[in-house]
Interface confidence: low
């Protein structure tokens, strides 16, 4: 007759924290007579999980009635799994002996891994705004996951970023882990509506990654471009000069007109036109009475944006 | 001695079309001697799926070697599953008899359901545009899914809608099913950038729902608001009157200026300013030579938008 084999069909079982884990084990024969036991780990330091013969194992239930005649199924279920239960479990057949039963054969083992989901990633950006062409840093953090293997990717408007550094802590074995990543993002003028996304993939998420986002509008300052032009006027003794302030972000802007270096008028931009890219435009005009001037006039449009140093553009108005 | 039990551990098994289905069955004893058979359905009309003793079953393979001494595992695998294979499968033990074997005991049955994915949902909107405060209907359709259980949700800009009617056809059993839903959406002035989303969740989609979208920009017409104002002018003999045409969609717009009811100028809007909400603004101005008028002048800004009836706003210009 073929010698008894101990079959543990699953090499590995992965269970979410809080669930029950079923560890399967079957014998191929009823002979030799003797009990089975389940252990976690192998060798001298192995931990008894279940003994068919004796003992109290409140979290363990058997899948079949082990006392039943002809039973060959010695599978067990362990309830309320925590990460501390991870390890390799062995189903071991003993042969009836005197005074003690003797270990006869062991199954190949089933590795139990315990899964815990990462927390929703939190993305934070720089404390102060930066201008286009400069690099800013964003951080992403997530905690409480197990196993340790995790993938973190950064995206800007759907395009994957590559300039980032990621750490998973702790380095050694732990009940759960944390991830921290810092990405460096180069700002462009069109980034007011841009978003950075931190995407985390983990075995517990079944292919549906967690994402944390941050808006670059909180991190960017786009300085305005100025254009001063003269508009046609039907009245001969008047000139209409406009200052087009274009593509700035955020809103805060103060404009001053100077005639030959002397302040003529100061305005705070209120009714702004928003561009498709999220930046703003504003236009101010100055009506100049040419009769009041004998010589040519230099008109200067001076703009202070978001508390930064003023920029200006001048226009020479010819008095003919 | 305990009597043999036929164990079918899974109450139900769900398989995707084209996959193999494993139906598990185990006996608790080697006695009595006799073959096992698998049937679909119960009673007189049941269909033989597999007979251990005889016959040719090309799509069926056994999981264990049934001829092996002491074998108690009578699980089978059926390849290339189609929706037509759905049903309840029974593992039945027969006792050797003469001339025929006699049915001894049946397992509790395993219900095999076959999964087929729904097609990508197609969303269509109304044939003609409607204005804000009016209700428009959107339809969503998806086909070819199984089982019949399916969830359909409607969203507008991420907010779930409740005013919709959904039907799944046919009402009775079928190889596959279709879903049709009609949602009623109240338009608002800010809906140019809005989207309606039809979201379908089904067991085959592994928690990743299918979505179909439609843009409300195809369904909405936002009529303009008009404002006529006089701008300050330093030149005494001229008045600058502007007509601000605000928040209209779609683009098509023609503006006519009338002085005391007589057409002064007609313009077609070209360079428009786009607002954050997707509507457009446009401004036209009229320079009026006040010297040419002895009495007050009524200036009228008349706008025809998107082929609709014209709207107008007048301004009384005082000639002092």
């Amino acid at each position: 007759e073929d010698e008894l084999q101990v079959i543990q069909p699953e090499k590995s079982v992965s269970v979410a924290a809080g669930e029950s884990a079923t560890l399967r084990c079957a014998m191929t024969s009823l002979i030799p007579v003797g009990p089975i036991m389940w252990f976690r780990g192998a060798g001298a330091g192995r931990e008894l999980i279940y003994n068919q013969k004796e003992g109290h194992f409140p979290r363990v239930t058997t899948v079949s009635e082990l006392t039943k005649r002809n039973n060959l199924d010695f599978s067990i279920s362990i309830s309320n799994i925590t990460p501390a239960d991870a390890g390799t479990y062995y189903c071991v057949k003993f042969r009836k002996g005197s005074p003690d039963d003797v270990e006869f054969k062991s199954g190949a083992g089933t590795e139990l891994s315990v899964r815990a989901k990462p927390s929703a990633p939190v993305v934070s950006g720089p404390a102060v705004r930066a201008t286009p062409e400069h690099t800013v840093s964003f951080t992403c953090e997530s905690h409480g996951f197990s196993p340790r293997d995790i993938t973190l990717k950064w995206f800007k408007n759907g395009n994957e970023l590559s300039d980032f550094q990621t750490n998973v802590d702790p380095a050694g074995d732990s009940v759960s882990y944390s991830i921290h990543s810092t990405a460096r993002v180069v700002l462009t003028r069109g980034d007011v509506h841009s978003q950075v996304i931190c995407e985390i993939a983990h075995i517990t998420l079944q292919g549906d990654p967690l994402r944390g986002t941050a808006n670059l509008s909180e991190a960017i300052r786009v300085p305005p471009t100025l254009e001063v032009t003269q508009q046609p006027m039907r009245a001969e003794n008047q000139a209409n000069v406009t200052c087009q302030v274009s593509n700035f972000y955020p809103r805060g802007l103060q404009l001053t007109w100077l005639e030959n270096g002397n302040v003529s008028r100061t305005e705070t931009a209120s009714t702004l036109i928003e561009n498709k890219d999220g930046t703003y435009n504003w236009m101010s005009w100055l009506l100049v009475n040419t009769c009041a001037h004998r010589d040519d006039v230099v008109l200067t449009c001076q703009v202070e944006h978001d508390g930064q140093q003023a920029v200006s553009k001048s226009y020479a108005l010819e008095i003919s | 001695e305990d009597e043999l039990q036929v164990i079918q551990p899974e109450k139900s098994v769900s398989v995707a079309a084209g996959e193999s289905a494993t139906l598990r069955c185990a006996m608790t004893s080697l006695i009595p001697v006799g073959p096992i058979m698998w049937f679909r359905g119960a009673g007189a009309g049941r269909e033989l799926i597999y007979n251990q003793k005889e016959g040719h079953f090309p799509r069926v393979t056994t999981v264990s070697e049934l001829t092996k001494r002491n074998n108690l595992d009578f699980s089978i695998s059926i390849s290339n599953i189609t929706p037509a294979d759905a049903g309840t499968y029974y593992c039945v033990k027969f006792r050797k008899g003469s001339p025929d074997d006699v049915e001894f005991k049946s397992g509790a049955g395993t219900e095999l359901s076959v999964r087929a994915k729904p097609s990508a949902p197609v969303v269509s909107g109304p044939a003609v545009r409607a204005t804000p405060e009016h209700t428009v209907s959107f339809t969503c359709e998806s086909h070819g899914f199984s089982p019949r259980d399916i969830t359909l949700k409607w969203f507008k800009n991420g907010n779930e809608l409740s005013d919709f009617q959904t039907n799944v056809d046919p009402a009775g059993d079928s190889v596959s099913y279709s879903i049709h839903s009609t949602a009623r959406v109240v338009l608002t002035r800010g809906d140019v950038h809005s989207q309606v989303i039809c979201e379908i969740a089904h067991i085959t989609l592994q928690g990743d729902p299918l979505r179909g979208t439609a843009n409300l920009s195809e369904a909405i017409r936002v009529p303009p608001t008009l404002e006529v104002t006089q701008q300050p002018m330093r030149a005494e003999n001229q008045a600058n009157v502007t007509c601000q045409v605000s928040n209209f969609y779609p683009r098509g717009l023609q503006l006519t200026w009338l002085e005391n009811g007589n057409v002064s100028r007609t313009e077609t809007a070209s360079t428009l300013i786009e607002n954050k909400d997707g509507t457009y603004n446009w401004m036209s101005w009229l320079l009026v030579n006040t010297c040419a008028h002895r009495d007050d002048v009524v200036l009228t800004c008349q706008v025809e938008h998107d082929g609709q009836q014209a709207v107008s706003k007048s301004y009384a210009l005082e000639i002092s």
Epitope: K11, S12, S14, D149, I150, T151, L152, E160, L161, S162, D163, F164, Q165, T166, A201, H202, I203, Q206, G207 | A16, Q206, D208
Partner: antibody
Framework: QIQLVQSGPELKKPGETVKISCKAS????????MHWVKQAPGKGLKWMGW????????TYVDDFKGRFAFSLEASASTAFFQINNLKNEDTATYFC??????????WGQGTTLTVSS | QIVLTQSPPIMSASPGEKVTLTCSAT???????LYWFQQKPGSSPKLWIY???NLASGVPARFSGSGSGTSYSLTISNMEPADAASYFC?????????FGGGTKLEIK
Amino acid sequence: QIQLVQSGPELKKPGETVKISCKASGYTFTHYSMHWVKQAPGKGLKWMGWINTETAEPTYVDDFKGRFAFSLEASASTAFFQINNLKNEDTATYFCARGGLRQGDYWGQGTTLTVSS
Amino acid sequence: QIVLTQSPPIMSASPGEKVTLTCSATSSVSASYLYWFQQKPGSSPKLWIYSTSNLASGVPARFSGSGSGTSYSLTISNMEPADAASYFCHQWSSYPYTFGGGTKLEIK
């Protein structure tokens, strides 16, 4: 232990079809993607694409769109790779490799395909 | 797509010698997604170094990896006959994933 076992060598004529299998064992098949890599004789490695073993959704590199198809039989923990309308330049060894969080940690032994008239 | 160029394509080294293989990318690659594989004739590739500098299971400590951005390298501190093989760098930082052309390392 974890293993990827591929089907045996194939000798085909131009215009024919071939289907290569890759059977996984020792881990939960649907937790890890499966990638396919081509190595022409005496040449380097070329990544062809991958299949999501949970959703069965394939992703192909531009050079391998059209005649190539990835598929699965998840219940048998097996991934497949098919080439239709074979050409001489398809002669190569094709590898399956496990993806996931540590890309390419396990590879199949390779399947040698020879296309010759 | 990111093209990975390995140099030199072929090199030979004496036992005990220090060897450095380089891998240069046409655009920046995340260090987390730069891997090295070893392949011997008639065998499938083996994961050798992952995430730029981590040795895969069973890889001798004489191997090390380093780099960032567009420039990466694999170093053997003292060459042994068992190290004779082809080494391929691989990025899966962005689609499509790509391999370098390989460096064939021979023993003198």
